[in-house]
Each structure stands twice: as structure tokens, then as C-alpha cells.
């Protein structure tokens, strides 16, 4: 004889000795029907805040408060955001290695400096862990009217003034 607990929907629990589908009590959930118990909802507090509230069928999801980022699966802990010159890995913030940079605050990866020579340009300003190399104009003969333009607009992740 098929156990009637098998027909229970998510958001309910069911005991085999009394096979009736019952709704999960408040602050609990079951994503699979027919289980003998509902699971206690996760609470997001301290450095955590709610990303998704708990429902009878889904656990709550947490994220970190401003200035912190998640580490671990399902955001098990919060760590202070990385600074420019670092990248966020699963092991936490790591300083960019020589020849790479990250100019973003709290996000982004360490990227290799631009190799100006590949685009036929010279290096105008060397790079750091926080800033890319700045390439000069193409290495060609210039007419008297040649100019170097400076753009004040913000770049990916918030670049400051850059020489094109």
C-alpha cells in the first residue's frame, strides 16, 4: 500500500504513524513534501541581512551588509570588502601579483597590465597593483596637430582620469 505521505506537497510535513499532510509551523520550511519534520528557517543577523525571506517551501537566503562580502557556499560568513590592489577569492582578499592590477573597491579580479607594445604604443605611465599601465599614443610620426585627449568619465569599476 502506498504511503499517503508520498503525496504531500512542499511546505508540509507528514508522520508515517499518522499519514496526514500538515503545514509547516511558522519559521520553518520544507522544500520536499512528505518529510517527517520541517527545517528551521535561517536567520540573517549581525553582518548578515535578508536577501530572500523564508517561506514554507524555501529557506531564507542571507547576504552581507554594505562593506562586507560573502564567503563560503550559501554565504556562510561575511568578510570585509577587498581594497583596490586586491581581488576577492574563495579564500578571501588576496593582493594582486606583480604585473596585475585591480582598481575596483570590493569587487573585480586582478587583471594583467595592458601590454602597450602589442598595440604599437609606448608606456606613458607604469602600472601598480591598483592601476593599469597608461599607454602613450601609437608609435608613429606625428603631424603638428596631434593631441592626446584626457577623458574624465568613470570607467569599468570607476576609473579616474585616464590618458587615451
Amino acid at each position: 500500500v502506498q504511503n499517503s505521505c508520498d503525496n504531500c506537497q512542499p511546505g508540509t510535513f507528514c508522520r508515517k504513524y499518522n499519514p496526514v499532510c500538515k503545514s509547516c509551523p511558522p519559521s520553518t520550511f520544507s522544500s520536499i513534501g512528505g518529510q517527517p519534520n520541517c527545517n528551521i528557517c535561517r536567520v540573517c543577523a549581525g553582518y548578515f541581512r535578508f536577501k530572500k525571506f523564508c517561506s514554507s517551501t524555501h529557506n531564507a537566503e542571507c547576504e552581507c551588509i554594505e562593506g562586507f562580502h560573502c564567503l563560503g557556499p550559501q554565504c556562510t560568513r561575511c568578510e570585509k570588502d577587498c581594497r583596490p590592489g586586491q581581488e576577492l577569492t574563495k579564500q578571501g582578499c588576496k593582493t594582486c601579483s606583480l604585473g596585475t592590477f585591480n582598481d575596483q573597491n570590493g569587487t573585480g579580479v586582478c587583471r594583467p597590465w595592458t601590454n602597450c607594445s602589442l598595440d604599437g604604443r609606448s608606456v606613458l605611465k607604469t602600472g601598480t597593483t591598483e592601476k593599469d599601465v597608461v599607454c602613450g599614443p601609437p608609435v608613429v610620426s606625428f603631424s603638428p596637430s596631434t593631441t592626446i585627449s584626457v577623458t574624465p568619465e568613470g570607467g569599468p569599476g570607476g576609473h579616474s582620469l585616464q590618458v587615451l
Epitope: Q91, T114, D119, D132, G154, P156, L164
Partner: antibody, heavy 121, light 107 residues
Framework: QVQLVQSGAEVKKPGASVKVSCKAS????????MHWVRQAPGQGLEWMGW????????NYAQKFQGRVTMTRDTSISTAYMELSRLRSDDTAVYYC??????????????WGQGTLVTVSS | ELELTQPPSVSVSPGQTASITCSAD??????ASWYQQKPGQSPVLVLY???KRPSGIPERISGSNSGNTATLTIRGTQPMDEADYYC?????????FGGGTRLTVLR
């Protein structure tokens, strides 16, 4: 809405060059890295490199260094990819793809429709 | 340089769960993304940072990444899920793609 519109199909002879354009709209062009990815017929995806549209900074996959040049024109929100010394095995669909902002590991959240480049004598 | 290895094909019956793997040495230390590509169309991002879904991607698509393997899971697979799937990561200044997996939904 975000859109990346690429130039039309090209047929080129071996040894020639091709320049593919990618016009961006619906977002701040200078705020996101632009990448180029190609796909040979019946094959997988192959990353070619990126350009930072704000600074013009580039990073090319080692395989394409010396043959590829990525540029942009911020006044018309357009990125370009030029591939020189074409060979028959460069026949592929070339995609521009926007790198998602504020994410890790460089995922591409929007893609152009692709440009078929055929290299044939 | 890291190499991402995917099975060339995976078959699944409608309504069943499909799992597509992507393997590389210590891949779990990195973040993986997944793309869906249907014939004649551009790729579409379906997962990033191992398990996050962009808006518009259904909850039945999920992901995990630990050890040497990242996994894309599609619950209640539908005919519309039939496509090529590519994993992708970032390693040593290079964007890497897996070779792709053709997901076939059996009729």
C-alpha cells in the same frame, strides 16, 4: 535595454585582415569591459581578449597576440576587433560580449548577435 | 594552464534532472559561470559565481562547484532546455571555456 549590435558577415581571402564592429546601447559604454569570443563552425567558444572602453587598455589571449587589435570609439559607443593575416581556420562566428559589472570571475551578461567571417581563397 | 573538461553529450527524459559537469584541477577554488547556446543563437549566461542566476533564469537551474568539479543542474528538464552548455572560468589572466556539452531531451 542593453544591446550589442555587430557588423555584417564578411568573406576574406587568406592573408587579408578583417575588422568587426560592435555598437553598444542601453548602458554606459565606458563602464564595462568588452570581450571578443569566437566560435568555429560546429566547435566551442574561444576567448580572444578584452578592451577597457574607458582607457583603451587591452588584454589578448596568447594565441592571438600579434594578430589581433582591439580598439574603441567612445563617441559612438562602438568596439572593434581587427584580425590580420587571416587563415582558413579563422573562419568562425565572432561575438562581442559585455563583461558583467561588479561580479567575480568575468562572466559575460550580454552578447552581440555574432558576425560570420569566412576565410576562403 | 587550466583546461576545462566537459562531457560531449548528456541525455535526459522530460521532467527528469539533468546534470552537466565541468572538471579541472582545483576548479572549486575558482568561480565558474555557465552559458546556454541554442542552434543559430548567441550564448546566454545562466549561472555565474558557481550558483547565482541572472534575472530571468528559472529557479530549476542551479549550480555547485567544489573540489575539481563544477556542476550545472536542471530540475524538471523541458524540451526548451535542449541546447549546448559551456562552463567558463578565469585563470592566470585568461578567460577559459569548456568544450561544451550537448543536452538532449529525449522525446
Amino acid at each position: 535595454q542593453v544591446q550589442l549590435v555587430q557588423s555584417g558577415a564578411e568573406v576574406k581571402k587568406p592573408g587579408a585582415s578583417v575588422k568587426v564592429s560592435c555598437k553598444a546601447s542601453g548602458y554606459t559604454f565606458t563602464g564595462y569591459y568588452m570581450h571578443w569570443v569566437r566560435q568555429a563552425p560546429g566547435q566551442g567558444l574561444e576567448w580572444m581578449g578584452w578592451i577597457n572602453p574607458q582607457s583603451g587598455g587591452t588584454n589578448y589571449a596568447q594565441k592571438f597576440q600579434g594578430r589581433v587589435t582591439m580598439t574603441r570609439d567612445t563617441s559612438i559607443s562602438t568596439a572593434y576587433m581587427e584580425l590580420s593575416r587571416l587563415r582558413s581556420d579563422d573562419t568562425a562566428v565572432y561575438y562581442c560580449a559585455r563583461e558583467g559589472g561588479e561580479w567575480l570571475a568575468i562572466p559575460f551578461d550580454y552578447w552581440g548577435q555574432g558576425t560570420l567571417v569566412t576565410v576562403s581563397s | 594552464e587550466l583546461e576545462l573538461t566537459q562531457p560531449p553529450s548528456v541525455s535526459v527524459s522530460p521532467g527528469q534532472t539533468a546534470s552537466i559537469t565541468c572538471s579541472a584541477d582545483k576548479l572549486g577554488d575558482k568561480y565558474a559561470s555557465w552559458y546556454q547556446q541554442k542552434p543559430g543563437q548567441s550564448p546566454v549566461l545562466v549561472l555565474y559565481e558557481d550558483s547565482k542566476r541572472p534575472s530571468g533564469i528559472p529557479e530549476r537551474i542551479s549550480g555547485s562547484n567544489s573540489g575539481n568539479t563544477a556542476t550545472l543542474t536542471i530540475r524538471g528538464t523541458q524540451p526548451m532546455d535542449e541546447a549546448d552548455y559551456y562552463c567558463q572560468t578565469w585563470d592566470t589572466n585568461t578567460v577559459l571555456f569548456g568544450g561544451g556539452t550537448r543536452l538532449t531531451v529525449l522525446r
